[in-house]
Every structure is written in structure tokens, then in C-alpha cells.
């Protein structure tokens, strides 16, 4: 059957931990992505940012997992109002920020 939302969020958190843990070289060769507002709709916004990073196997699983939280299909070049369009950050920092926010959401019981 379908994975419970709490399990899916915990698995996403653990995947982000693995990414930050296994950084030997700069993540995704130091690629830059749009920063996002960590608010409602944040999963789609995060996916929209990360989907524009190509050729980076380290975040492919994260992209797939985020797509499970986003109710609509996301493709490269797509941007929502949740992006801070004047601010780009490295993928590594993006992942760290997202991880901390997701841990707080998990604590608050916001699994969707």
C-alpha cells in the first residue's frame, strides 16, 4: 500500500542526511539554485529549484522523493512565487537549509 506521510518525510530527511554526510567534493560541482521560501508549497518549490540541476546523481533520489510530496508535475525551467528570485545558493547549502526545516516540520507533525 501507500507509504504513510510520516514515513515518507522521515525517509526524505534521512536521504538529505546521507547527501550532506557523503560530501567528498562540492555537491553537484558547486551548482547554484534559486533559494526558496520555506513555507506552504515548499516541496514543489524545492523540487522546482533542484530539477534545474542536471547531471548530478547525488540528488536524483531526493528529486524523486520530493516529487512524491508535490501534487503537480514539475519540469525544468518552471518557477513558482515561492522562489526568492534574486538569491541563488549552492546546492549543498540548499540541502542543509531544507533538511533543518524538514526536521522541524516532522517534530510539529506536519507530514504533508
Amino acid at each position: 500500500g501507500p507509504v504513510p506521510p510520516s514515513t515518507a518525510l522521515r525517509e526524505l530527511i534521512e536521504e538529505l542526511v546521507n547527501i550532506t554526510q557523503n560530501q567528498k567534493a562540492p555537491l553537484c560541482n558547486g551548482s547554484m539554485v534559486w533559494s526558496i521560501n520555506l513555507t506552504a508549497g515548499m516541496y514543489c518549490a524545492a523540487l522546482e529549484s533542484l530539477i534545474n540541476v542536471s547531471g548530478c546523481s547525488a540528488i536524483e533520489k531526493t528529486q524523486r522523493m520530493l516529487s512524491g510530496f508535490c501534487p503537480h508535475k514539475v519540469s525544468a525551467g518552471q518557477f513558482s512565487s515561492l522562489h526568492v528570485r534574486d538569491t541563488k545558493i549552492e546546492v549543498a547549502q540548499f540541502v542543509k537549509d531544507l533538511l533543518l526545516h524538514l526536521k522541524k516540520l516532522f517534530r510539529e507533525g506536519q507530514f504533508n
Partner: antibody, heavy 122, light 108 residues
Framework: QMQLVESGGGVVQPGRSLTLSCAAS????????MHWVRQAPGKGLEWVGV????????HYADSVKGRFTITRDNSKNTLNLQMNSLRAEDTAVYYC???????????????WGQGTMVTVSS | SYILTQPPSVSVAPGQTATITCGGN??????VHWYQQKPGQAPVLVIY???DRPSRIPERFSGSNIGNTATLTISDVEEGDEADYYC???????????FGGGTKLTVL
């Protein structure tokens, strides 16, 4: 100012019971999860248990499960720790501490009492 | 249950940087809190949610949490920083709060 004050500590024989209290003041007690933490002489901190803001849930460390019971009275801003079947290894300073209540009780303890000493000895 | 491992002691000269670690399986997936405890006193929260600092705590105190290790860093160490430091997490699988064994920070 915000304050937690423990009371009820003392010397008790093994196998006997003791109840500790924690009086809260200066903040909205009913909106916080409340924890008990203990510290044996010369040892580290050991979490004892927690009661949720509305008293609906309690969780305990394995070392006290079935022997200790945490209750609260939000109308009186008090927290209690009922300790039964006390053992020598329960000898410690007992602290109450508050933590903002979320869906899960993973918050940090931002306010602690000064502690009360419990000695279990024959 | 979940285990947090801290070094028993860390020594540092005044003005230097102290690093206290807290190891745990995939601790990076948990929110880590740090407490300072001086002899005869109750613990005081110095870092919460991995890296946030209560308003009364100096900027010299910082935290990070990556992979299997959380770290408390105290820069420009002062004699008044000498104390025991404890890390703490909530273990979701057992519904228990867990403390590390504590690290005694000695300022030489």
C-alpha cells in the same frame, strides 16, 4: 519572573514511595510539555519522563517505567512525580524542566528548576 | 534505545576554540540541543535545534549537525566557560529523550 521550584526531596528507604512536586510561575504552564530529569551524584543527566501540555500523554525512561508516574494539575500550575518501589540507584538530584509542546516532544528545555535531592538508603 | 556518545573531557587554553562532539547513528536526522552545567547549578540551554542560540547566550557558542556527528563549538574560550556540556535528542522510535554522557570542558 519565570520560575520552576521543586520540592519533596529527602531520605527514603528502599522499596518505599516518595512524591516530588514542581511549582511553576511566571508563564502559561498549560501550554508547555513538562519533563523530569535526574542526576546521580557525580554522574551525567538522565531523562526520567515527560507529560504533555494537556496531560493526555506520558512517556518514561525504561529505568523508571512501571514505578514512576508523572501527573500535572494545570489549574494549580503544578507538576508531580510519584516514585514507587524506590531503589538505591534512584538516588539523585531531580529537576523539572519545561519544553514548548509540539506534536512530538522534541523541543529543548528552556527553563529548569533548581533541583531537589532524593536519597534512597536504609 | 538511541545512544549519544560524547568525549569525557576536552581541554583548551583561554582564547582558543573548543570543539565538543556528540555522536549518534544518523544524528543529522534529529534536532540536537546542547546544555551547559556548572557545579551545583541546574543545566542551561546554550544551543537548540542544531544551531540556534538563545538570546542570552554569547555568539561565541555555535552548533552544527551533519551525518553521524553533532558539534558544539565555543570560540575565544573564557574561564567562565568551564563546565559540563550535554547534547540531547528526542528518539522518535522509543518516545524517549536521550542525553549524551556529558563532556567536561577544562580551560587551561
Amino acid at each position: 519572573q519565570m520560575q520552576l521550584v521543586e520540592s519533596g526531596g529527602g531520605v527514603v528507604q528502599p522499596g518505599r514511595s516518595l512524591t516530588l512536586s514542581c511549582a511553576a510561575s511566571g508563564f502559561e504552564f498549560r501550554t508547555y510539555g513538562m519533563h523530569w530529569v535526574r542526576q546521580a551524584p557525580g554522574k551525567g543527566l538522565e531523562w526520567v519522563g515527560v507529560i504533555w501540555d494537556d496531560g493526555s500523554n506520558t512517556h518514561y525512561a525504561d529505568s523508571v517505567k512501571g514505578r514512576f508516574t508523572i501527573t500535572r494539575d494545570n489549574s494549580k500550575n503544578t507538576l508531580n512525580l510519584q516514585m514507587n518501589s524506590l531503589r538505591a540507584e534512584d538516588t539523585a538530584v531531580y529537576y523539572c524542566a519545561r519544553a514548548p509542546q509540539w506534536y512530538l516532544t522534541a523541543e529543548a528545555f528552556d527553563l529548569w528548576g533548581q533541583g531537589t535531592m532524593v536519597t534512597v538508603s536504609s | 534505545s538511541y545512544i549519544l556518545t560524547q568525549p569525557p573531557s576536552v581541554s583548551v587554553a583561554p582564547g582558543q576554540t573548543a570543539t565538543i562532539t556528540c555522536g549518534g547513528n544518523l544524528i543529522g536526522a534529529k534536532l540536537v540541543h546542547w546544555y551547559q552545567q556548572k557545579p551545583g547549578q541546574a543545566p542551561v540551554l546554550v544551543i537548540y535545534d542544531d544551531s540556534d542560540r538563545p538570546s542570552r547566550i554569547p555568539e561565541r557558542f555555535s552548533g552544527s549537525n551533519i551525518g553521524n556527528t553533532a558539534t558544539l563549538t565555543i570560540s575565544d574560550v573564557e574561564e567562565g566557560d568551564e563546565a559540563d556540556y550535554y547534547c540531547q535528542v528526542w528518539d522518535y522510535s522509543s518516545d524517549t529523550m536521550v542525553f549524551g554522557g556529558g563532556t567536561k570542558l577544562t580551560v587551561l
